[in-house]
């Protein structure tokens, strides 16, 4: 008789799951000097214990504390490039511009990325049916308490000016109930970071609007300068000129406002 | 190229009010705050106040009660209304930009209007 | 309110001289602090924010250390047109302070 099993609204875990950990800290780590000793076996091992087993609604962040403790990285702390509903720019940039880092570019951002994985309560198996939804089913789930923990350290290790790219096609340009809005923007030190510099990045090509009028991001500078950090808003006008503009600065074209 | 230039100043006597102005161009008063700050003559600079690109202010409490700081974004302007002034408040009085959206330190500065208090 | 104390108070110093000037606040403000030089009858200029980073177009010879309580602003080599007052400035609290000034002379 087969055992009943929790149907959740979300996906499932992403196939292969433990294969594609193992084999993305493996690529990590041989590609990044300063993180070799990592046993990738281990980091494997203390991952699955975060979740496996375990009531997929009421996961902790203390469940996650033997793998922050293995993924322990040091990056620049005043290159910290934040983002939000924007990843895929944000990543290449920082491909281009190699000394700033997204969470993404870090070991345990790099092994979960746009992966999905939870387990069963009193069983050792990952369940690959369905995983619990943000929304529709418990926030405590494996997925989010992971991207809640690992932001909350990367927001705290910042230091001097961090940047945040922020998609102004988007209604709400910054939103209180993204993991920027909820998490980074609460964690940031202001005892080590003195400014935020937002980016908004514009959709449009014929979109000339300073969307840092936008009542979202005086809202967020009114966030950020009630915790004592100062706030700066550029706009992107031509995020395909700007990405240009890292890769070749020199370019004469690059002298106006991108 | 960025510029803010203070008038308003002269010979006020003790109890009167008077209005300074800040007129700037080069850049945008909806994108960057503009701070006053005063110099007694032979003295230190002394910080009265802020008002930021949203409308928002803030104050040193010394000045509070008698000084309010406002603007006009579409006659990009700042203005230090002074009231109940006092042979203490004469002093180079400048206007100055902030360098971010919201920071309080500042990059350019006016030249100055000199407040002389006395009857 | 936080106090800012400059030393010394006046200084005059040679063509080609290092010239250092420190300011101590009455409490941690950490790194948030500017420098800026007012020269005689002229309005004040940032040189430095941030405790350490120098402001575009100020020359390298300006410098400034320090974090938490004490902080030093740096001429590495001092020229004619370096003569000014020279005044620290935080910005951890309201209301803003500045030092008491320290004016630079060649000798």
């Known amino acids: 008789v087969p055992r009943w099993r929790q149907q959740w609204s979300g996906p499932g875990t992403t196939k292969r799951f433990p294969e594609t950990v193992l084999a993305r800290c493996v690529k990590y780590t041989e590609i990044h000097p300063e993180m070799r000793h990592v046993d990738c076996q281990s980091v494997w091992d203390a991952f699955k214990g975060a979740f496996i087993s375990k009531h997929p609604c009421n996961i902790t962040e203390e469940d996650y504390q033997p793998l922050m403790k293995l993924g322990t990285q040091t990056v620049p702390c005043n290159k910290i490039l934040l983002w939000s509903r924007i990843k895929d720019l944000a990543h290449q940039f920082t491909q281009v511009q190699r000394d700033m880092f997204t969470l993404e570019d870090t070991l345990l951002g790099y092994l979960a990325d746009d992966l999905t994985w939870c387990g069963e309560f009193n069983t050792s198996k990952i369940n690959y049916q369905s995983c619990p939804d943000w929304r529709k089913d418990c926030s405590n789930n494996p997925v989010s308490v992971f991207w809640k923990t690992v932001s909350r350290r990367f927001a705290e290790a910042a230091c001097d000016v961090v940047h945040v790219m922020l998609n102004g096609s988007r209604s709400k340009i910054f939103d209180k109930n993204s993991t920027f809005g909820s998490v980074e923007v609460h964690n940031l030190q202001p005892e080590k970071v003195q400014t935020l510099e937002a980016w908004v990045i514009h959709g449009g090509r014929e979109d000339s609007r300073d969307l840092c009028q936008d009542p979202t991001i005086k809202e967020l500078e009114s966030i950020i300068s009630k915790r004592n950090i100062q706030f700066s808003c550029k706009n992107i006008y031509r995020p395909d000129k700007f990405l240009q503009c890292v890769k070749n600065p020199e370019d004469s074209s690059c002298t106006s406002e991108i | 190229q960025v510029q803010l230039v203070e008038s308003g100043g002269g010979v006020v006597q003790p109890g009167r009010s008077l209005r300074l102005s800040c007129a700037v161009s080069g850049f945008s008063l909806t994108n960057y705050g503009v701070h006053w700050v005063r110099q007694a003559p032979g003295k230190g600079l002394e910080w009265v106040a802020v008002i930021w690109r949203g409308g928002s202010t803030d104050y040193s409490a010394a000045f509070m009660s008698r000084f309010t700081i406002s603007k006009d974004n579409s006659k990009n302007t700042v203005y230090l209304q002074m009231n109940s002034l006092r042979a203490e408040d004469t002093a180079v009085y400048y206007c100055a930009k902030t360098t971010l959206t919201r920071v309080w330190y500042v990059d350019v500065w006016g030249q100055g209007t000199l407040v002389t208090v006395s009857s | 309110d936080i106090q800012m104390t400059q030393s010394p108070s006046s200084l005059s110093a040679s063509v080609g001289d290092r010239v250092t000037i420190t300011c101590k606040s009455s409490?941690?403000?950490?790194?948030?602090l500017a420098w800026y030089q007012q020269k005689p009858g002229k309005a004040p200029k940032l040189l430095i924010y941030?405790?350490?980073s120098l402001e575009t177009g100020v020359p390298s010879r300006f410098s400034g250390s320090g974090s938490g309580t004490d902080f030093t602003l740096t001429i590495s080599s001092l020229q004619p047109e370096d003569v000014a007052t020279y005044y620290c400035?935080?910005?951890?609290?309201?209301?803003?302070?500045f030092g008491q000034g320290t004016k630079v002379e060649i000798k």
């Open positions: 400035q935080q910005y951890w609290n309201t209301p803003l302070t």
């Open positions: 941030g405790a350490t």
């Open positions: 409490e941690d403000i950490y790194n948030r």
